[in-house]
């Protein structure tokens, strides 16, 4: 089956959600780990990640269609210390499959705002930190 990983971001007030979404078949969930790394060009692994999610097979989902599993990493207030390059990755201990998402970046600017760039589908988010709105 076709397995892929995408990265996205959303804002709720001052909170920034970084989301790693893995699309896979139901039976492929077992043994899969999704993880998010920061500033790790070569050694992104569950052990060096900021957060990881171990997928479990959900017997409640019928059929063999494609399903998605999400890892959400929430930053309550983005600060200059969050500036850097992030990457969503996944791997299967069962099949040996390794997935690496596109690199995306958080840049905290001198004005106190931040931008998230490099997301799939040319998604470019610019946030005003103080106002907590999408600008």
């Amino acid at each position: 089956g076709c397995i892929n990983i995408t990265s996205s971001a959303s804002q709720e007030g001052t909170r920034l959600n970084l989301i790693c979404t893995v699309w896979h078949k139901k039976e492929e969930a077992e043994g899969f780990v999704v993880f998010l790394c920061k500033d790790r060009s070569g050694d992104c692994s569950p052990e060096t990640s900021l957060k990881q999610l171990r997928l479990k097979r959900d017997p409640g989902i019928d059929g063999v269609g494609e399903i998605s599993s999400q890892l959400m990493f929430t930053i309550s207030q983005v600060t200059p210390l969050h500036s850097g390059t992030y990457q969503c990755c996944a791997r299967s201990q069962k099949s040996g499959i390794r997935l690496q998402g596109h690199f995306f970046s958080i840049l905290f600017t001198e004005t106190g705002n931040y931008t998230v760039t490099g997301l799939k589908q040319r998604q470019h988010l610019e946030f005003s930190h103080n106002e907590g709105t999408l600008s």
């Epitope: 007030g13 920061k38 210390l81 500036s83 850097g84």
Partner: antibody
Framework: EVQLVESGGGLVQPGRSLKLSCAAS????????MAWVRQAPTKGLEWVAS????????YYRDSVKGRFTISRDNAKNTQYLQMDSLRSEDTATYYC????????????WGQGVMVTVSS | EIVLTQSPTSMTASPGERVTITCRAS?????MHWYQQKPGASPKPWIY???KLASGVPDRFSGSGSGTSYSLTINNMEAEDAATYYC??????????FGAGTKLEIK
């Protein structure tokens, strides 16, 4: 278990230098931004400086800018605070602390090291 | 720079009493964190993001507030709660600021 152990404190004359170290264990040090927070005798807490996980970005409170330098060695799981041109008002217990990645709280603190600046 | 003003600066409470410590910010802030510090010890995170209790903190503690006014409340004061409590916030560009502390003693 997370452990932060500071060292390098002591008595120093005004205008002189001192370098503090903080040895970290029990977590993936290279993933976390780190900070120094100080507390003058019988006084409150005061943030001094922070450094990002990779060590490339540093931030300071205005009163120590140009005199203090925060740095880290991820291979040694250690962060440092180089303190130059010390003043009597720098006398304090200096705490090493970790930045919580998802929040702006300092979640782990060392036991602190005393720095006394006096002639 | 945002200034955090804690009140009272010190207080004494009886066991079982309800205690409220307030922290006022000179400008609106998004979240407030609270730390507990006992004599000779390091500060411990106690309440974070205004109302979330840190690991191991008894549920007699609670936090609330928004904008410029925040508070930490102890529902039934116990002897082990005697300590100094500090509020803390983050904003740009002054970064991290703390209140001057509230010393809480037991009768």
């Amino acid at each position: 278990e997370v452990q932060l152990v500071e060292s390098g404190g002591g008595l120093v004359q005004p205008g002189r230098s001192l370098k503090l170290s903080c040895a970290a264990s029990g977590f993936t040090f290279s993933n976390y931004a780190m900070a120094w927070v100080r507390q003058a005798p019988t006084k409150g807490l005061e943030w001094v400086a922070s450094i990002n996980s990779g060590g490339g970005n540093t931030y300071y409170r205005d009163s120590v800018k140009g005199r203090f330098t925060i740095s880290r060695d991820n291979a040694k799981n250690t962060q440092y605070l180089q303190m130059d041109s010390l003043r009597s008002e720098d006398t304090a217990t200096y705490y090493c602390a970790t930045h919580n990645y998802e929040s702006t709280v300092f979640d782990y603190w060392g036991q602190g090291v005393m720095v006394t600046v006096s002639s | 720079e945002i200034v955090l003003t804690q009140s009272p600066t010190s207080m004494t409470a009886s066991p079982g009493e309800r205690v409220t410590i307030t922290c006022r910010a000179s400008s609106s802030v998004s979240y407030m964190h609270w730390y507990q510090q006992k004599p000779g010890a390091s500060p411990k995170p106690w309440i974070y993001e205004t109302s979330k209790l840190a690991s191991g903190v008894p549920d007699r503690f609670s936090g609330s507030g928004s904008g410029t006014s925040y508070s930490l409340t102890i529902n039934n004061m116990e002897a082990e709660d005697a300590a100094t409590y500090y509020c803390q916030q983050w904003n740009y560009p002054s970064m991290y600021t703390f209140g001057a502390g509230t010393k809480l003693e037991i009768k």
